[in-house]
């Protein structure tokens, strides 16, 4: 299926979005930085197909939502400018779920990426545990919100790879 | 493990209004949509519609728009149902039921209902 | 819109026989969006299959579900006493996100 092109406006104004809710230099948070191991070759379109690497995308995007519409969340962040996000993630999850309906039909669903879901889900459990341990802290949202970028970023360049296989 | 609490049992005349609410603790995600849905006596189920909390996004089903407004607080998460121009055919216990967030994948998780209220029975009477 | 028709309407056993519980759908369902429930008087609904045939947490494994397209089965292989109530299947659509119950088919001791 093809995603609507709003598809990847609302993922770069999402990535813009959690750039401006930055609130402290990442060079004050140097002491609380973490490598989270995200699992770049799981999420990567080069290694996956278009109808796997949807449900792949979609829990990215789930647990991303989940962890920024967490009650701590709404007291470190802009209201603003986190509705907005929040609001982008979810017409994100929208069309990523209206592409699988169409896509899958009655065929089996891509569970081949079983592995890649759990990487996943595994990666973003790191992160809650962390901002757990540190008290949901400034610096700790901080270095989150960071790290969410990065896993954005990613997979806005699993879309664009995937726009140009068609 | 996420459990919802619906509120009591009501009686209400034709045309009025009622409000169901439903009070949801455990591993709770405001991310994840509550829906509610209905089953008159002696009947099957029947989906009415659901919200996001997190954001306040609700879905209709199409027999129920004009007449059903679902409202949610995100603190403590709570789901609010209101059925308004009450016929006595709205007589029928009314369920909140969430998704699972266990399941994977996400997507696959939010189509079914894993947690269900106990029922809050409406009775439309004169 | 979606219909989902379940048959029989009542199926009367004994405890110790098979029972398979049909679910026909009007128009192609993904088996992974085709969910079963079971029903005891009184009782909330109770998820038991999902997917299409992962069973939920607790289910026992005498249940299971199969099917693909616009026809599915919940099969419980051996009926203990506890079995006996209303099974439904549900479907879901999106977008807009739809969730679509059948009838129920009640599970009677015969």
């Known amino acids: 299926c093809d995603l609507p092109q709003t598809h990847n406006l609302r993922n770069k104004r999402a990535l813009t979005l959690l750039v401006q809710m930055r609130r402290l230099s990442p060079l004050s948070c140097l002491k609380d930085r973490k490598d989270f191991g995200f699992p770049q070759e799981k999420v990567d379109a080069q290694q996956i197909k278009k109808a796997q690497a949807i449900p792949v995308l979609s829990e990215l995007t789930q647990q991303i939502l989940n962890i920024f519409t967490s009650k701590d969340s709404s007291a470190a962040w802009n209201t603003t400018l986190l509705d907005s996000f929040c609001n982008d993630l979810h017409q994100q999850l929208n069309d990523l779920q209206g592409c699988l309906m169409q896509q899958v039909g009655v065929q089996e669903f891509p569970l081949t990426q079983e592995d890649a879901l759990l990487a996943v889900r595994k990666y973003f459990h790191r992160i809650t545990v962390y901002l757990r341990e540190k008290k949901h802290s400034p610096c700790a949202w901080e270095v989150v919100r960071a790290e969410v970028w990065r896993a954005l970023s990613s997979s806005a360049n699993v879309l664009g790879r995937l726009r140009e296989e068609k | 493990e996420v459990q919802l609490l619906e509120s009591g049992a009501e009686v209400k005349r034709p045309g009025s209004s009622v409000r169901v609410s439903c009070r949801a603790s455990?591993?709770?995600?405001?991310?994840?949509?509550i829906s509610w849905v209905r089953q008159a006596p002696g009947q099957g189920l029947e989906w009415m519609g659901r919200?996001?909390?997190?954001?306040?996004?609700?879905n209709y089903a199409q027999n129920f728009r004009g007449r059903i407004t679902i409202t949610a607080d995100k603190s403590p998460l709570t789901a609010y149902l209101e059925l308004s121009s009450l016929r006595f055919e709205d007589t029928a216990v009314y369920y909140c039921?969430?998704?699972?967030?266990?399941?994977?994948?996400?997507?696959?998780?939010?189509?079914?209902?894993?947690?269900w209220g106990q029922g809050s029975l409406v009775t439309v009477s004169s | 819109e979606i219909v989902l028709t379940q048959s029989p309407g009542t199926l009367s056993l004994s405890p110790g026989e098979g029972a398979t519980l049909s679910c026909r759908a009007s128009?192609?369902?993904?088996?992974?969006?085709l969910t079963w429930y079971q029903q005891k008087p009184g009782q909330s609904p109770r998820l038991l299959i999902y997917?299409?045939?992962s069973r939920a947490t607790g289910v026992p494994d005498r249940f299971s579900g199969g099917g693909s397209g616009t026809d599915f089965t919940l099969t419980i292989s051996r009926l203990e006493p506890e079995d006996f109530a209303v099974f439904y299947c549900q479907s879901y659509h999106s977008p807009p996100p739809v969730y679509t119950f059948g009838q129920g088919t009640k599970v009677e001791i015969k």
């Open positions: 919200i996001l909390p997190a954001l306040g996004v609700t």
């Open positions: 039921a969430s998704p699972s967030a266990d399941i994977i994948p996400s997507i696959l998780g939010t189509t079914l209902f894993a947690f």
């Open positions: 455990g591993d709770t995600f405001s991310s994840y949509p």
């Open positions: 997917g299409g045939s």
């Open positions: 128009q192609n369902v993904s088996r992974h969006y």
